[in-house]
C-alpha cells in the first residue's frame, strides 16, 4: 500500500539499527572514496530526518522519494567534483536519471588499499570502546570495496563479526580465537560478494526475466515438493528483492527480503520440510539460513519429463501461446529432478529446449523434429561433468596453490593481453573452487563448481569491460551469462599474441619478499609465473615447472641465508639466466 512518507515507513519497518546500517551501506556503495566519518555524518542526518517524519508524516520533504532524499544528500557533499570527477554530473539530472547515473559510476575495482585487519588486541580495544562505530567501519569498508554487496546479507556478516569479537575478546588468546573465525567470515563474505555481483549483472544485462529464470531453477532444486505456482511466487518476490538491491534501493530490498522470509516461514507446508530450523532464528540469521537451506527430499513418484514436454500432442501449441509459462514449467520440472546440476547447466538445457521448439514447431511434422531433444541434452550435460572430474582430479594431485598455478598458466595462455594482477586474482579465485567444491559429495560437486566459476568469470568480465584488451575475453563476455563458462573453458592459446620481451627486472626479487605473509609470497611467485607465460606462451608444463621449482629453491635458499641481500643480488641474476635458458 502507498505510504505518505516512504522514509518513515522504512524506518518503522526496519528499526533504527538496520535502517542506519543500510543507509551507511548505500552511501558507501555510491560514493566509494568518502571517509567513514563523512558518511557517518550523512547517515545521522538522514536518520534524524526519518525520525521527524515518523513523528509527523506531513512534515516538510517527508513525502519525497528515497532516491530524491538520498541523492540530494550525496549531491550536497562538498568537493564532489574534485573527489569524484564526472560522477558530479549526475547531480545535474532529475530522478530517476540521477540514480541511474550514480549506479553507472559504481566502481567494481576501486583503487582502495586492501582492507587490513588490525591485530587482535587493538581490534578488541576499539570494539569494546565503541561497538557501534566499530561495526560502522566494517560496513563502510566492505561496502565501498564491494559496491553491489547484498546489503541485508552484509548486515548479517556484520552481526557475525560482532558475535565473534564479543566471544574472542573475552578470551586470553584473542589472536588464535579471532583469526580462524574472522578468516571464515571473510571467505564467505567474498564468495557472497561475487555471487551477488553475478545476479546484478544478470539483471542489468539481460533484465528481470533472465534473473527470474535463474531463481526458478535454483528454487525448484531446493524446494522440489513446492508446486509451480509456489515456485513462481517465490521467484517473483526474490527477483523484486534483488532488483531493489542491485538498483541501490537498499531499504526496500531489506524490507522485502524480511517479508519474503516471513512468508516462507508461514508457508513451510507448501514449500519445504527443511525450513523449521531457519525459521526459529532471528531475522538476519533466518534470511541467511533460508538462502542456503539444504535441498528438500525429492518426491518419489515424479513422472518422466518426456510426458509433458515431448510426447504431449499440444507441446507446440502450449509453447507458442505462452512461452513464459510453458518454458518456466519445463525449467521447474527439470530442475526439481536435478539438484545435482548447476543452475547454469539447467538454464542451458532450457535454452536448448526452447531453441528446438522454435526451430521445429512450424515444420510439417514437429514431433519428428523435436522428438530427440532430451537425448540432445547429453553432450551439454557431459561437458561440465568432465570439467568437474578433470579439475577436481588436478586439484587433488596439486593442492590449492599448485592448482591455482595450473589455472594461471591456462588462463594467461587464453588471454595474455589481460593485466597480470587481474590474471593472478582470477586464477587464485578460480583455484579456490577446488577447496570449496572438490571435497563435497559427488552429487554436489557440479552445481558448486560451475556456479562458482561463473560468478568468478563474471568478475573477470566486469574488470575487462573497463579496459578491453583481449578479443577472446570480449567474445566470451559478450555472450549470454550461462554460456560464459563453457566459452572460457573452450578457449585455447591465443595465436594472435605477440610474446612479451623478456625483462630481467620483472624477475628480480629482493630480501623483503622473505618477510611477507605466505599469501603475499604466493602472489609474487604467481605474478612471475604469469609474466613467464606472457614471455613464452607456448612453454610446456615441464619447462614452467622447472623454472618455478628453481625459483622456489632460490627463494628458500636466500631467505635462509645469513646475508639475504647479498644472496638475492648475486643469485638473482643467475636465476634469470637459468630461466631464459630453460625456456629457450
Amino acid at each position: 500500500e502507498a505510504h505518505k512518507s516512504e522514509i518513515a515507513h522504512r524506518y518503522n519497518d526496519l528499526g533504527e539499527q538496520h535502517f542506519k546500517g543500510l543507509v551507511l551501506i548505500a552511501f558507501s556503495q555510491y560514493l566509494q572514496k568518502c571517509s567513514y566519518d563523512e558518511h557517518a555524518k550523512l547517515v545521522q542526518e538522514v536518520t534524524d530526518f526519518a525520525k521527524t517524519c515518523v513523528a509527523d508524516e506531513s512534515a516538510a520533504n517527508c513525502d519525497k522519494s528515497l532516491h530524491t532524499l538520498f541523492g540530494d544528500k550525496l549531491c550536497a557533499i562538498p568537493n564532489l567534483r574534485e573527489n569524484y570527477g564526472e560522477l558530479a554530473d549526475c547531480c545535474t539530472k532529475q530522478e530517476p536519471e540521477r540514480n541511474e547515473c550514480f549506479l553507472q559510476h559504481k566502481d567494481d575495482n576501486p583503487s582502495l588499499p586492501p582492507f587490513e585487519r588490525p591485530e587482535a588486541e587493538a581490534m578488541c580495544t576499539s570494539f569494546k570502546e565503541n561497538p557501534t562505530t566499530f561495526m560502522g567501519h566494517y560496513l563502510h569498508e566492505v561496502a565501498r570495496r564491494h559496491p553491489y554487496f547484498y546489503a541485508p546479507e552484509l548486515l548479517y556478516y556484520a552481526e557475525q563479526y560482532n558475535e565473534i569479537l564479543t566471544q574472542c575478546c573475552a578470551e586470553a588468546d584473542k589472536e588464535s580465537c579471532l583469526t580462524p573465525k574472522l578468516d571464515g567470515v571473510k571467505e564467505k563474505a567474498l564468495v557472497s560478494s561475487v555471487r551477488q555481483r553475478m545476479k546484478c549483472s544478470s539483471m542489468q544485462k539481460f533484465g528481470e526475466r533472465a534473473f527470474k529464470a535463474w531463481a526458478v531453477a535454483r528454487l525448484s532444486q531446493t524446494f522440489p515438493n513446492a508446486d509451480f505456482a509456489e515456485i513462481t511466487k517465490l521467484a517473483t518476490d526474490l527477483t523484486k528483492v534483488n532488483k531493489e538491491c542491485c538498483h541501490g534501493d537498499l531499504l526496500e530490498c531489506a524490507d522485502d527480503r524480511a517479508e519474503l522470509a516471513k512468508y516462507m516461514c508461514e508457508n513451510q507446508a507448501t514449500i519445504s520440510s527443511k525450513l523449521q530450523t531457519c525459521c526459529d532464528k532471528p531475522l538476519l540469521k533466518k534470511a541467511h539460513c533460508l538462502s542456503e537451506v539444504e535441498h528438500d527430499t525429492m518426491p518419489a513418484d515424479l513422472p518422466a519429463i518426456a510426458a509433458d514436454f515431448v510426447e504431449d500432442q499440444e507441446v507446440c501449441k502450449n509453447y507458442a501461446e505462452a512461452k513464459d509459462v510453458f518454458l518456466g514449467t519445463f525449467l521447474y520440472e527439470y530442475s526439481r529432478r536435478h539438484p545435482d546440476y548447476s543452475v547454469s547447466l539447467l538454464l542451458r538445457l532450457a535454452k536448448k529446449y526452447e531453441a528446438t521448439l522454435e526451430k521445429c514447431c512450424a515444420e510439417a511434422n514437429p514431433p519428428a523434429c523435436y522428438g530427440t531433444v532430451l537425448a540432445e541434452f547429453q553432450p551439454l550435460v557431459e561437458e561440465p561433468k568432465n570439467l568437474v572430474k578433470t579439475n577436481c582430479d588436478l586439484y587433488e594431485k596439486l593442492g590449492e596453490y599448485g592448482f591455482q598455478n595450473a589455472i594461471l598458466v591456462r588462463y594467461t595462455q587464453k588471454a595474455p593481453q589481460v593485466s597480470t594482477p587481474t590474471l593472478v586474482e582470477a586464477a587464485r579465485n578460480l583455484g579456490r573452487v577446488g577447496t570449496k567444491c572438490c571435497t563435497l559429495p559427488e552429487d554436489q560437486r557440479l552445481p558448486c563448481v560451475e556456479d562458482y566459476l561463473s560468478a568468478i568469470l563474471n568478475r573477470v568480465c566486469l574488470l575487462h569491460e573497463k579496459t578491453p584488451v583481449s578479443e577472446h575475453v570480449t567474445k566470451c563476455c559478450s555472450g549470454s551469462l550461462v554460456e560464459r563458462r563453457p566459452c572460457f573453458s573452450a578457449l585455447t592459446v591465443d595465436e594472435t599474441y605477440v610474446p612479451k620481451e623478456f625483462k630481467a627486472e620483472t624477475f628480480t626479487f629482493h630480501s623483503d619478499i622473505c618477510t611477507l605473509p605466505e599469501k603475499e609470497k604466493q602472489i609474487k611467485k604467481q605474478t612471475a609465473l604469469a609474466e613467464l607465460v606472457k614471455h613464452k606462451p607456448k612453454a610446456t608444463a615441464e619447462q614452467l615447472k622447472t623454472v618455478m621449482d628453481d625459483f622456489a629453491q632460490f627463494l628458500d635458499t636466500c631467505c635462509k641465508a645469513a646475508d639475504k641481500d647479498t644472496c638475492f643480488s648475486t643469485e638473482g641474476p643467475n636465476l634469470v639466466t637459468r630461466c631464459k635458458d630453460a625456456l629457450a
Epitope: Y319, A320, K323, V325, E354, E358, A362, E363, A364
Partner: antibody, heavy 121, light 110 residues
Framework: EVQLLESGGGLVQPGGSLRLSCAVS????????INWVRQAPGKCLEWIGI???????FYATWAKGRFTISRDNSKNTVYLQMNSLRAEDTAVYYC???????????????WGQGTLVTVSS | DIQMTQSPSSVSASVGDRVTITCQSS???????LSWYQQKPGKAPKLLIY???KLTSGVPSRFSGSGSGTDFTLTISSLQPEDFATYYC???????????FGCGTKVEIK
C-alpha cells in the same frame, strides 16, 4: 525464383465476407509457415495470423473469430477467410513466409505484393 | 497491452548522414525476437535485421541493429539514395498472438 502472389481483394460491403488467396511458386509450401499481415492506407503494419506447415493456426487477439487461415498444400496456396468486415478492415493484405528455422518469431523473409481490400457501402 | 513505439515518426537526412531509429517495447520482447523492415512506397516490406542485430543476407553492412529487452536501435551509418524509405520494427512476445509492428519511421530527403 520464389514468389508469393495474393489475390481475391476488392470492394466489399460492411458485414460482408471475402476470401483472399496466397499462391506460392518456386518452393514446396508444405514445408513453410505463412503469415498474413495488413496495412491500412498510410498506417502501421498489423500482423493477422500464421499457419504452420502442420496446419496449426494462431491469430492476433483482435482477429480471433472473424478471420480464418487455411492451406491447401496440393495447390501450394494459403487462404485468409474474412467475415463480418468493417470499414476499418480496409487495407492492403500481404502474405509472408516466416524465415525457416523459426516458428513464433516475427521474421518474414518473403512477401507477396499485396492485395487491396476496400470495405465500403 | 503490447506497445511498440517507434521514434522519430519521420526524419529528414542527407546522403552520407548517420541515421538512428529507436523502437521501444512494452513489455520486453521475447528472447530478442526483434526485427527491422524497410518498405518503399507501393512495395512490400523487406526484412533487414532479425534477432535484434543479425543482418539478413544481401543487406548492406551500413545497416546495423542493437539493443535488448525493451529498447532497440536501427542505425544506418552512411545514408545512401536507395535508403530513403519507411522503416518498421517487429516484435515477438511470450504469446505468438501478441506479434506486433511499430508504426514506422519515414526517412526523407532533406
Amino acid at each position: 525464383e520464389v514468389q508469393l502472389l495474393e489475390s481475391g481483394g476488392g470492394l466489399v460491403q460492411p458485414g460482408g465476407s471475402l476470401r483472399l488467396s496466397c499462391a506460392v511458386s518456386g518452393i514446396d509450401l508444405s514445408n513453410y509457415a505463412i503469415n498474413w499481415v495488413r496495412q491500412a492506407p498510410g498506417k502501421c503494419l498489423e500482423w493477422i495470423g500464421i499457419i504452420w506447415a502442420s496446419g496449426t493456426t494462431f491469430y492476433a487477439t483482435w482477429a480471433k473469430g472473424r478471420f480464418t487461415i487455411s492451406r491447401d498444400n496440393s495447390k501450394n496456396t494459403v487462404y485468409l477467410q474474412m467475415n463480418s468486415l468493417r470499414a476499418e478492415d480496409t487495407a492492403v493484405y500481404y502474405c509472408a513466409r516466416t524465415v525457416p528455422g523459426y516458428s513464433t518469431a516475427p521474421y518474414f523473409d518473403l512477401w507477396g505484393q499485396g492485395t487491396l481490400v476496400t470495405v465500403s457501402s | 497491452d503490447i506497445q511498440m513505439t517507434q521514434s522519430p515518426s519521420s526524419v529528414s537526412a542527407s546522403v552520407g548522414d548517420r541515421v538512428t531509429i529507436t523502437c521501444q517495447s512494452s513489455p520486453s520482447v521475447w528472447s530478442n525476437f526483434l526485427s527491422w523492415y524497410q518498405q518503399k512506397p507501393g512495395k512490400a516490406p523487406k526484412l533487414l535485421i532479425y534477432e535484434a542485430s543479425k543482418l539478413t543476407s544481401g543487406v548492406p553492412s551500413r545497416f546495423s541493429g542493437s539493443g535488448s529487452g525493451t529498447d532497440f536501435t536501427l542505425t544506418i551509418s552512411s545514408l545512401q539514395p536507395e535508403d530513403f524509405a519507411t522503416y518498421y520494427c517487429g516484435g515477438g512476445y511470450s504469446s505468438i498472438s501478441d506479434t506486433t509492428f511499430g508504426c514506422g519511421t519515414k526517412v526523407e530527403i532533406k
